[in-house]
């Protein structure tokens, strides 16, 4: 065998069983651990790059990664690994994560394009909304491309609608 271990990282435990569960997802005990952005293919007997299958029907094992990859292809959006959702930068400009810096900084130069709430935020009138449902929580489990924690950010109902649209 040659070439199969090139992208593996050390320190991951592996077990001897290699099988698929009925749903096509790897079963907890029976799967081998793979580096992030890879999955265990039991027929091939190796870890495979999720990138290779994002264009195929068989995305079950890499659904989150593929959503993230597709999201990053869209301008003005980023994938939040905590929310597991594709977030529109337009909805959070003003207190945006670094992934939205380019988009928001260009947007903020022409505030006419911003929704009223964000124009108010831009001029210092941050809404005092006690509903924490839209708050971004920091997480140590985020992927390397996840947004930084934004504990102070609260989103209005309108903004949440944009975030989840």
């Amino acid at each position: 065998m040659s070439g199969l271990g090139r992208s593996r990282r050390g320190g991951r435990s592996r077990v001897d069983q290699e099988e698929r569960s009925p749903q096509g997802l790897w079963t907890g005990v029976a799967m081998r651990s793979c580096p992030e952005e890879q999955y265990w293919d039991p027929l091939l007997g190796t870890c495979m790059s999720c990138k290779a299958i994002c264009n195929h029907q068989s995305q079950r094992t890499c659904a989150t990664f593929c959503r993230s990859l597709n999201c990053r292809k869209e301008q003005g959006r980023f994938y939040d690994h905590l929310l597991r959702d594709c977030i529109s930068c337009a909805s959070i400009c003003g207190q945006h994560p670094k992934q939205c810096a380019y988009f928001c900084e260009n947007k903020l130069r022409s505030p006419v394009n911003l929704p009223p709430e964000l124009r108010r935020q831009r001029s210092g009138e941050v809404e005092n909304n006690s509903d924490n449902s839209g708050r971004y929580q920091g997480s140590e489990h985020r992927g390397s491309e996840a947004s930084p924690a934004l504990p102070g950010l609260k989103l209005s109902a309108d903004q949440l609608a944009l975030v989840y649209s």
């Epitope: 065998m1 040659s2 070439g3 290699e18 698929r20 569960s21 039991p42 027929l43 091939l44 290779a52």
Partner: antibody
Framework: QVQLVQSGAEVKKPGASVKVSCKAS????????MHWVRQAPGQRLEWMGY????????KYSQKFQGRVTITRDTSASTAYMELSSLRSEDTAVYYC???????????WGQGTTVTVSS | DIQMTQSPSSLSASVGDRVTITCAAS??????LNWYQQKPGKAVKLLMR???RLHSGVPSRFSGSGSGTDFTLTISSLQPEDFATYYC?????????FGGGTKLEIK
């Protein structure tokens, strides 16, 4: 449409090597794993090995380990299977097959007959 | 390696007949069982993946069932073009393994 076209029949002497080619068309060659499977007369299909689409990684059946080498030329969308130290029991039809990522082989080449005879 | 046992090894039938071929795995393979059709001098064709999902272009007279270790391929009404050899293959464990084949002949 997806097509895998293999090279023509070969007759080899024991101890020699054979290299079979498989030209792919109708899809992005580097998006799929290519496998090689053989079938000796009157025998079942037998998996030999595969090559990964993105880093030339290979994995072989223990039975053929050390005798088989699978390579590819991405610019020509072609995969190759070379079997060395041929013996009479290697007389078989050799197939390339595309892996569909879900445990099955969705497209196969037409097969290449290799005859090993002194 | 997982052993795949197909039965019968050969079968004679007539056009219009309903035919069933079975495949048994030596250990649980969930639903990762595929069926292929092979005709002399032609490329092997995938008929069915994941026990019962027809591959594109395969007629609906072919159906599959089973789970775990026991599986069947059924042809509801044999057509002249269906006379061929059929193979099962497990896609659940490395390395992939195939059944011994069932040769379907005209009676």
């Amino acid at each position: 449409q997806v097509q895998l076209v293999q090279s023509g029949a070969e007759v080899k002497k024991p101890g020699a090597s054979v290299k079979v080619s498989c030209k792919a068309s109708g899809y992005t060659f580097t998006n799929y794993v290519m496998h090689w499977v053989r079938q000796a007369p009157g025998q079942r299909l037998e998996w030999m090995g595969y090559i990964l689409p993105y880093n030339d990684g290979t994995k072989y059946s223990q039975k053929f380990q050390g005798r088989v080498t699978i390579t590819r030329d991405t610019s020509a969308s072609t995969a190759y299977m070379e079997l060395s130290s041929l013996r009479s029991e290697d007389t078989a039809v050799y197939y390339c097959a595309r892996y569909d990522w879900e445990g099955s082989f969705d497209y196969w080449g037409q097969g290449t007959t290799v005859t090993v005879s002194s | 390696d997982i052993q795949m046992t197909q039965s019968p090894s050969s079968l004679s039938a007539s056009v219009g007949d309903r035919v069933t071929i079975t495949c048994a795995a030596s250990q649980d393979i969930s639903n990762y069982l595929n069926w292929y059709q092979q005709k002399p001098g032609k490329a092997v064709k995938l008929l069915m993946r994941y026990t019962s999902r027809l591959h594109s272009g395969v007629p609906s007279r072919f159906s599959g069932s089973g789970s775990g270790t026991d599986f069947t391929l059924t042809i509801s009404s044999l057509q002249p073009e269906d006379f061929a050899t059929y193979y099962c293959q497990q896609g659940n464990r490395f390395p992939p393994t195939f059944g011994g084949g069932t040769k379907l002949e005209i009676k």
